[in-house]
């Protein structure tokens, strides 16, 4: 049964509505439809929104309600409803319109040109529209050419159209240049600008898009495609003319393009059937509008059957580079037609097997070639149609420039050191292809230096090279080559062993091949100092005393030594520098800087830390050493002397052990008189024990003990009483 | 025919104000817009602005703005540009013209020479 | 402002050659470009609009194309009346910008 049109909410055939409203209209349908809008309402605009309801009675209807919000003057045009899916022939009646003036005062053209006008290309004799169509019915447009003419609308040449413009059925010349629709709106003046354009006879460009020149088996096909380009307001004539034109071989179709919107393009293709060795020779393609010519042409060469020749370019065994970023593998190839290209690494298709690799023409490119593009490559040409089939080999070594392992792999960011004196073995280990060679040379430090970094030394202080006979630096043990697998590769491992470590200097590794050469520095930095860097203190001073530390560190590595006191205030740690310092000594593996403070006091207790800035890292470091001086206090006994007995010939110790600040001196008399260290008679650490070997009567008597310090002495006696009679008498 | 008459050369001092008048011909400037252009040996050809005359609605160069008024007398058919504070830069042949894709109307040029 | 950057700035060809003039624009500029001949002492003189119309009365010889911001004058058989000073002009936007102009000598 017949379908009734959808319906519009809004009725009649146009409707106007101010600018700044809110368009709503419905659609009410027997079928799902759908709407078609002006070209400027974009469907995704978010001013647009459609609901789809089902209506009607039982919901046997289907309803789409179209909302634009804010409608303004340029959303002025048609908007209908369309059944989706109908049969064609049903097509008429399934559609239903309106035509909507969206009305802004300030703006009373749809489309407004006042600037740049809209070129509109026109054909004398043909209808003419000047597209000025208006945003409301009620407004009346003049249409005037530029100098002095305005063309009136008689309703039969010349007819005005509010949802249109201006109508001109037959172009005339006269209607050729500046066109300008004028309205006033409430006394203003609107202009909008149209340029009208003839045709011209300028054709820009002429092409052959087939391969030049054009090759054929006989008994194909040839088809040849003519483009000619020219401005919009241009039309052409495109010939052809060719070997066996005589006897009319070719058919041609022709097609324009005018979809562009700065050039039409026109196509001319000639198609020639079982080609033979007679249409062979030059295809003309001639392109005339008016006055102008333009021409191209191209031969065509005609094959018996088809074949395929293949050679090396260059030789058969290929060089590249690791690292470079395209490698193009090339076959001279001569064969027709064209055959299918299959390139084999290894024996295995090429491009399955990494996508690094590319098949261009008779090419294989090798994108960021890597060792592993190493190998034979085949090129397999075949043309299956003729039962032609070719193939060639090539064989590919990708040369690796020398890496140094140890290089990749050392996180230190400062040199190591060594302890003087110390044997040493030094390993470069290299990977190259072909095998790299590896030398090892010598750089000596200068030996003035002392701000500067040893590795930072100027050029012209030569590197010498060395073997195991070398006299250069330091006394050298044997330099030996071995190979090494690593990580699943054949490594070149160098060492060098340094018998005495004396002098400091750079140790350079350099691996070569044919490919490049790379090194590596090993700074080698002897060092006096335990770890580059030692604080040492003589002695834990007691008031009064002279406080006297020494700051030592690695001169190659350290500089700016100084002394700082740490003090805590606030729970803020602030550094103070001690003006006391001397200079530092340089020597020939370190730098030391002492500090001393003479006649120290309690308030000279703290932390005293030595400050000195890495070379490499920039980074400074600290030694602190905690100083407590020490208030002076008066000596005294842990235990006094007691009288003791001892037998002859025995041995015997007297113990005077005494605590004081400063560490009380002892000093010891027996019956008055001043005890020194003779043979027999042994004072022990500090005075403080008395031992006596082989006890004769003469030792019996009293002993004493005085400890003494600034601040007073301390004293003990007793009495040591020998026993028994002397071997001397016995033996008397 | 269409033509565009520019006044006559004017030579000023430095500091002053010079008015140039250009008077179409065979059109009304109603109904297109006049535009001004400099030309000189150093800057070459400079646009400088240019009018509507029925709403005397203007558009400048920036660079021009403050040394250029333009204006138009609809009466007269003229369009008019004023320049103010001259200094030798100034010195130029100063064109009217219609809008480039409005054929080919230039006028012929006044040659304006800043001098104490 | 748009820039349009003219080449070359001298040109020297002989009769019956055929020379092309070139216009870059620093931005886009559509088809907005006007291109104009200047001969000493005379006021410039159009020749091409919309990139690639030509005026009436403008010999077919001066062809014009481009769009975006690359823009060409072709002169295809060059006479010595064609000896002038030739600029281009864009008038996409405000301000309106020329070229810095190419001189054309003839041999």
């Known amino acids: 049964s017949k379908l009734k049109d959808p319906e519009l909410s809004l009725k009649g055939t146009q409707h106007i509505m101010q600018a700044g409203q809110t368009l709503h209209l419905q659609c009410r349908g027997e079928a799902a439809h759908k709407w078609s809008l002006p070209e400027m309402v974009s469907k995704e605009s978010e001013r647009l929104s459609i609901t789809k309801s089902a209506c009607g009675r039982n919901g046997k209807q289907f309803c789409s309600t179209l909302t634009l919000n804010t409608a303004q003057a340029n959303h002025t045009g048609f908007y209908s409803c369309k059944y989706l899916a109908v049969p064609t022939s049903k097509k008429k009646e399934t559609e239903s319109a309106i035509y909507i003036f969206i009305s802004d005062t300030g703006r009373p053209f749809v489309e407004m040109y006042s600037e740049i006008p809209e070129i509109i290309h026109m054909t004398e004799g043909r209808e003419l529209v000047i597209p000025c169509r208006v945003t409301s019915p009620n407004i009346t447009v003049t249409l005037k050419k530029f100098p002095l003419d305005t063309l009136i609308p008689d309703g039969k040449r010349i007819i005005w159209d509010s949802r249109k413009g201006f109508i001109i059925s037959n172009a005339t010349y006269k209607e050729i240049g500046l066109l300008t629709c004028e309205a006033t709106v409430n006394g203003h003046l609107y202009k909008t600008n149209y340029l009208t354009h003839r045709q011209t006879n300028t054709i820009i460009d002429v092409q052959i898009s087939t391969p030049r020149p054009v090759k054929l088996l006989r008994g194909h096909t040839l088809v040849l495609n003519c483009t000619a380009t020219t401005p919009l307001n241009t039309r052409v004539q495109m010939t052809w003319s060719y070997p066996d034109e005589k006897n009319k071989r070719a058919s041609v179709r022709r097609r324009i393009d005018q979809s562009n919107s700065h050039a039409n393009i026109f196509y001319s293709v000639l198609t020639i059937d079982k080609m033979q060795n007679k249409d062979k020779g030059l295809y003309t393609c001639r392109v005339r509008s008016g006055p102008s010519f333009k021409s191209v042409n191209t031969s065509v060469h005609i094959y018996d059957k088809a074949f395929i020749t293949v050679k090396h370019r260059k030789q058969q065994v290929l060089e590249t580079v690791a690292g470079k970023r395209s490698y193009r593998l090339s076959m001279k190839v001569k064969a027709f037609p064209s055959p299918e290209v299959v390139w084999l690494k290894d024996g295995l298709p090429a491009t399955e097997k990494s996508a690094r690799y590319l098949t261009r023409g008779y090419s294989l490119i090798i994108k960021d070639v890597t060792e592993e593009d190493a190998g034979n490559y085949t090129i397999l040409l075949s043309i299956k149609q003729s039962n032609v089939f070719k193939n060639l080999t090539a064989t590919l070594i990708v040369n690796v420039k020398p890496q140094i392992y140890e290089k990749a792999v050392s996180s230190f960011p400062d040199p190591a050191l060594y302890p003087l004196g110390s044997r040493q073995i030094l390993t470069c280990t290299a990977y190259g292809i072909p095998q790299p060679t590896i030398k090892w040379f010598w750089h000596p430090c200068n030996h003035n230096h002392s701000e500067a970094r040893c590795d930072f030394c100027s050029n012209n202080e030569e590197s010498f090279i060395l073997d195991a006979d070398s006299n250069m630096g330091n006394r050298i043990e044997s330099i030996t080559q071995r190979m090494a697998i690593i990580e699943g590769k054949n490594k070149m491992a160098s060492t060098l062993v340094v018998a005495d470590s004396r002098i400091s200097g750079i140790y350079i590794c350099i691996a070569s091949n044919k490919v490049g050469t790379v090194g590596r520095n090993i700074s080698f930095y002897i060092t006096d100092v335990p770890n580059g860097f030692h604080v040492n203190l003589e002695k834990m001073p007691t008031e009064g005393e002279d406080l006297k530390l020494s700051c030592t560190v690695n001169k190659f590595l350290y500089r700016d030594v100084t002394w700082i006191l740490l003090r805590t205030v606030n729970n803020r740690t602030m550094h103070y520098s001690i003006s006391k310092q001397k200079m530092a000594i340089t020597k020939e593996h370190s730098i030391t800087l002492n500090l001393t403070i003479m006649n120290v006091s309690l308030q000279d207790s703290g932390t005293y830390a030595c400050r000195a800035r890495n070379v490499y890292t920039g980074e400074e470091i600290l030694q602190k050493k905690e100083i407590t001086i020490r208030d002076q206090e008066a000596p005294y006994l842990l235990r006094n002397l007691s009288d003791h007995t001892v037998a002859i010939s025995s041995s015997t110790t007297l113990d005077c052990h005494a605590n004081g600040v400063p560490e009380p001196q002892i000093t010891w008399f027996k019956n008055n008189h001043k005890i020194q260290q003779e043979p027999g008679i042994i004072l022990g650490p500090g005075s403080s024990t008395l031992f006596i070997e082989r006890v004769t009567e003469e030792d019996e008597g009293v002993y004493h003990c005085k400890a003494t310090n600034q601040k007073g002495s301390v004293e003990s006696s007793a009495y040591l009483t020998v026993q028994g009679t002397s071997d001397k008498s016995n033996l008397e | 025919q269409v033509k565009l008459q520019q006044s006559g050369a004017e030579l000023v001092k430095p500091g002053a104000s010079v008015k140039l008048s250009c008077t179409a011909s065979?059109?009304?400037?109603?109904?297109?817009?006049i535009h001004w252009v400099k030309q000189s040996p150093e800057q070459g050809l400079e646009w400088i602005g240019r009018i509507d005359p029925p709403n005397d609605n203007t558009k400048y160069d920036p660079k021009f703005q403050g040394k250029a008024t333009i204006t138009a007398d609809t009466s007269s058919n003229t369009a008019y540009m004023q320049l103010r504070s001259l200094t030798s830069e100034d010195t130029a042949v100063y064109y009217c013209?219609?809008?480039?894709?409005?054929?080919?109307?230039w006028g012929h040029g006044t040659t304006v020479t800043v001098s104490s | 402002d748009i820039e349009l950057t003219q080449s070359p700035k001298f040109m020297s060809t002989s009769v019956g050659d055929r020379v092309s003039v070139t216009c870059k624009a620093s931005?886009?500029?559509?088809?907005?470009v006007a291109w104009y001949q200047q001969k000493p002492g005379q006021s410039p003189k159009a020749l091409i609009y919309s990139a690639s119309y030509r005026y009436s009365g403008v010999p077919d010889r001066f062809t014009g194309s481009g769009s975006g911001t690359d823009f060409t004058l072709t002169i295809s058989n060059v006479q010595s009346e064609d000896l002038a000073e030739y600029f281009c002009q864009q008038y996409n936007s405000f301000p309106y910008t020329f070229g810095g102009g190419t001189k054309l000598e003839i041999k």
């Open positions: 065979g059109f009304n400037i109603k109904d297109t817009y």
């Open positions: 013209a219609l809008p480039p894709f409005y054929f080919d109307y």
């Open positions: 931005q886009n500029v559509d088809t907005n």
